[in-house]
């Protein structure tokens, strides 16, 4: 029963992570710039995202412009776009794998196969979390590097936008949710399927596999 509870918690966290990731990728708030002129009338905030940039005037009026040419975009922006989309698709794939192996579904009958599917979905969600983390950390690194670069003009310096924080939250939720799904499935090791099934039926697995066992450090 505890295992089922962890599974549900895990999938809820990954779903929240996926939604966060989607919002993070879609919102044009990756980089934020504040231009303050001599007069408060010309004060404006520029939001830059993966797909468009927006200018918010002091009056509250907002104008957004979708980036024109894909080929004219900086390579890091193209890479961030690609990684964001791939991360979201990978997480969706993870959800489908999970649904196939969930305790409450009948797609797969054998308990050991279900356990493997849930474990696989957990791993897929962890991969999605890492993929989400890469563009977010890369962008944050660039913003921070610019901030401390004395030759970058003040007007060119950016601040961390809300999308980056959402991206970090998304990545954390996907990693945590994926990790929980991995933990709900006991490791078969060298033992046969009968042992695996017997151990799967117990509520508290003797050996759990946490997210820390996956080499996420290589990606950050």
């Amino acid at each position: 029963m505890a295992s089922a509870g962890m599974q549900i918690l895990g999938v809820v966290l990954t779903l929240l992570g996926w939604v966060n990731g989607l919002v993070s990728c879609a919102l044009p708030m990756w980089k934020v710039t504040a231009f303050i002129g001599n007069s408060i009338v010309v004060a404006q905030v520029v939001w830059e995202g993966l797909w468009m940039s927006c200018v918010v005037q002091s009056t509250g009026q907002m104008q957004c412009k979708v980036y024109d040419s894909l080929l004219a975009l900086p390579q890091d922006l193209q890479a961030a776009r690609a990684l964001c989309v791939i991360a979201l698709l990978v997480a969706l794939f993870g959800l489908l794998v999970y649904l196939a192996g969930a305790k409450c579904t009948t797609c797969v009958e054998e308990k050991d196969s279900k356990a493997r599917l849930v474990l696989t979905s957990g791993i897929v969600f962890v991969i999605s979390g890492v993929l989400t983390l890469i563009p977010v950390c890369w962008t944050a690194h660039a913003i921070i590097r610019d901030f401390y670069n004395p030759l970058v003009a003040e007007a060119q310096k950016r601040e961390l936008g809300a999308s980056l924080y959402l991206g970090w939250a998304a990545s954390g939720l996907l990693l945590l949710g994926g990790g929980l799904l991995c933990c709900t499935c006991p490791s078969g090791g060298s033992q046969g399927p009968s042992h695996y099934m017997a151990r799967y039926s117990t509520s508290a697995p003797a050996i759990s596999r946490g997210p820390s066992e996956y080499p996420t450090k290589n990606y950050v």
Partner: antibody
Framework: EVKLVESGGGLVQPGGSLRLSCAAS????????MSWVRQTPAKRLEWVVT????????YYPDSVKGRFTISRDNAKNTLYLQMSSLRAEDTAVYYC????????????WGQGTLVTVSS | DIQMTQSPSSLSASVGDRVTITCRAS??????LAWYQQKPGKSPQLLVY???LLVDGVPSRFSGSRSGTQFSLTISSLQPEDVARYYC?????????FGSGTKLEIK
Amino acid sequence: EVKLVESGGGLVQPGGSLRLSCAASGFTFNSYTMSWVRQTPAKRLEWVVTISSGGGRTYYPDSVKGRFTISRDNAKNTLYLQMSSLRAEDTAVYYCIRGDYRYDGFAYWGQGTLVTVSS
Amino acid sequence: DIQMTQSPSSLSASVGDRVTITCRASENIDSYLAWYQQKPGKSPQLLVYASTLLVDGVPSRFSGSRSGTQFSLTISSLQPEDVARYYCQHYYSIPYTFGSGTKLEIK
């Protein structure tokens, strides 16, 4: 009008010291990053040092680190470059440079002061 | 250190010609590149920053472009007053380095 006037250049023996000054006017001195860049007799440009607007952060290349020291007196609107353990390869025209709010890089250059290191 | 390889070292062209000076970085510098113009007997002046952005007051015949680690400064129609030495400079990381310069002359 932005005005940067360097002084203090001259002939110095290898191993000697020299202090360059840069008098700034026409802008709010304490709002800008300042730098020194030199131009060798072969016309090559070399970045020497940069200091933040408040003076709290300084940036040096390895070639001058430990030998050159940049400082600024925001009350006097003056930038300084203290050079010691001078070598023949330090012979160059030294330019005082102001950064800009809008533009990256070295935005405004002084007329330069010549430093010759020779025995 | 990042090396900036500038070419050609000297260039002679006629008034009205299209002139291109290139600068290649030894490693990735994103768009952290500036171009400077130094007229005879004068101090250098900033022309282009962030690889493509023109400083106010710089004639529109000047333009900057980037392709990976290769950067170009183009003068669409050479004018007599463009006779100068041109330098590229990266500001991606310390130490900031300049190209060796291109001396541009009129034929």
